[in-house]
């Protein structure tokens, strides 16, 4: 069964800046990755970025930089300032659509005890 992993890290240099990394463990052709916060995309979450392997990347504030790390993993940096900036207990979710298996998603947040720079 395919799985999705999610890591959330607070940047040591900018305490309200986050890096989210997500990866897909499974076969099939990854067609789309959707990153959201505040819950899964289908359950009230707000989309931060959509990454397509051929048609490019779309991102919305406070997302600063979304990119493919490998063919099956992505990373997203969030801006740390402004009214829409995330807080330490924000939930981030990644949904990988793989053809023809379907969609697989997982969520993660910064552990409450984490020091800046530690990965979840």
């Amino acid at each position: 069964t395919p799985e999705v992993w999610v890591q959330v890290r607070m940047e040591a240099t900018e305490l309200s800046s986050f890096t989210i990394r997500c990866g897909f463990l499974g076969s099939g052709s990854i067609s789309l990755v959707t990153v959201s916060w505040g819950g899964p995309n289908g359950a009230g979450g707000t989309t931060l970025a959509v990454l397509h392997p051929e048609r490019g990347i779309r991102q919305w504030a406070p997302a600063r930089q979304a990119r493919w790390e490998t063919q099956s993993s992505i990373s997203l940096i969030l801006e740390g300032s402004g009214a829409s900036s995330p807080c330490a207990n924000t939930t981030f979710c990644c949904k990988f659509a793989s053809f023809p298996e379907g969609s697989w998603e997982a969520c993660g947040s910064l552990p409450p005890s984490s020091d800046p720079g530690l990965s979840a």
Epitope: G28, S29, L32, R55, E101, G102, S103
Partner: antibody, heavy 120, light 107 residues
């Protein structure tokens, strides 16, 4: 304008074979996953086969596994369905459809359908 | 396989009526639900994707809602051209499965 045109349907005896074709135009065929969906007379819709954009991944439900083979030729903008060991219950209109990644794999374009009748 | 149970299977209504069709999935399908309209002898046409997004050219009287396992297609004010059969579909896990259809007829 996106167009999908099926051909190859007809009357065939039980145990016989048919090869359906779907000619695509108006879009970059190699960028889209494709499927065959059938509809028996007066019945609902059933996915019978799916293939990824590069042709590397395929899917078949148990009802047709081992009898049907989906393939595509991206150079010819064509999708195929080879149907062997046909049964009376395979009688249906067969539609070629295109999956849109950005729409959660919803099928945003369909052909007009080709009728396959399996009868002695 | 994920089952999509659609209700009602048939429905009689008049022009101008507000109509609701429901679809229940046997397990959570996130927001990967689409709705299609099919007229006799024609191919299905995509109406709604991702639960609530109208496809290009679909009139605003069509709307979708729901989450998890329960989804709804609403036609706010029926027009003569809306009498057709409607199918829900989940595209969350293969095989993509469809509801059995709702035939909307003129009262």
């Amino acid at each position: 304008e996106v167009q999908l045109v099926e051909s190859g349907g007809g009357l065939v005896k039980p145990g016989g074979s048919l090869r359906l074709s779907c000619a695509a135009s108006g879009f970059t065929f190699s960028s889209y996953h494709m499927s065959w969906v059938r509809q028996a007379p007066g019945k609902g819709l059933e996915l019978v086969s799916a293939i990824s954009r590069d042709g590397d991944s395929t899917y078949y439900p148990d009802t047709v596994k081992g009898r049907f083979t989906i393939s595509r030729d991206n150079a010819k903008n064509s999708l195929y369905l080879q149907m062997n060991s046909l049964r009376a219950e395979d009688t249906a209109v067969y539609y070629c459809s295109r999956h849109e990644d950005y729409f959660g794999f919803a099928m945003d374009s369909w052909g007009q359908g080709t009728l396959v009748t399996v009868s002695s | 396989d994920i089952q999509m149970t659609q209700s009602p299977s048939s429905l009689s209504a008049s022009v101008g009526d507000r109509v609701t069709i429901t679809c229940k999935a046997s397990q959570s399908v996130s927001n990967d639900v689409a709705w299609y309209q099919q007229k006799p002898g024609k191919a299905p046409k995509l109406l709604i994707y991702y639960v609530s997004n109208r496809f290009t050219g679909v009139p605003s009287r069509f709307s979708g809602s729901g989450s998890g396992t329960d989804f709804t297609l609403t036609i706010s004010s029926l027009q003569p051209e809306d009498f057709a059969t409607y199918f829900c579909q989940q595209a969350y896990r293969s095989p993509w499965t469809f509801g059995q259809g709702t035939k909307l007829e003129i009262k």
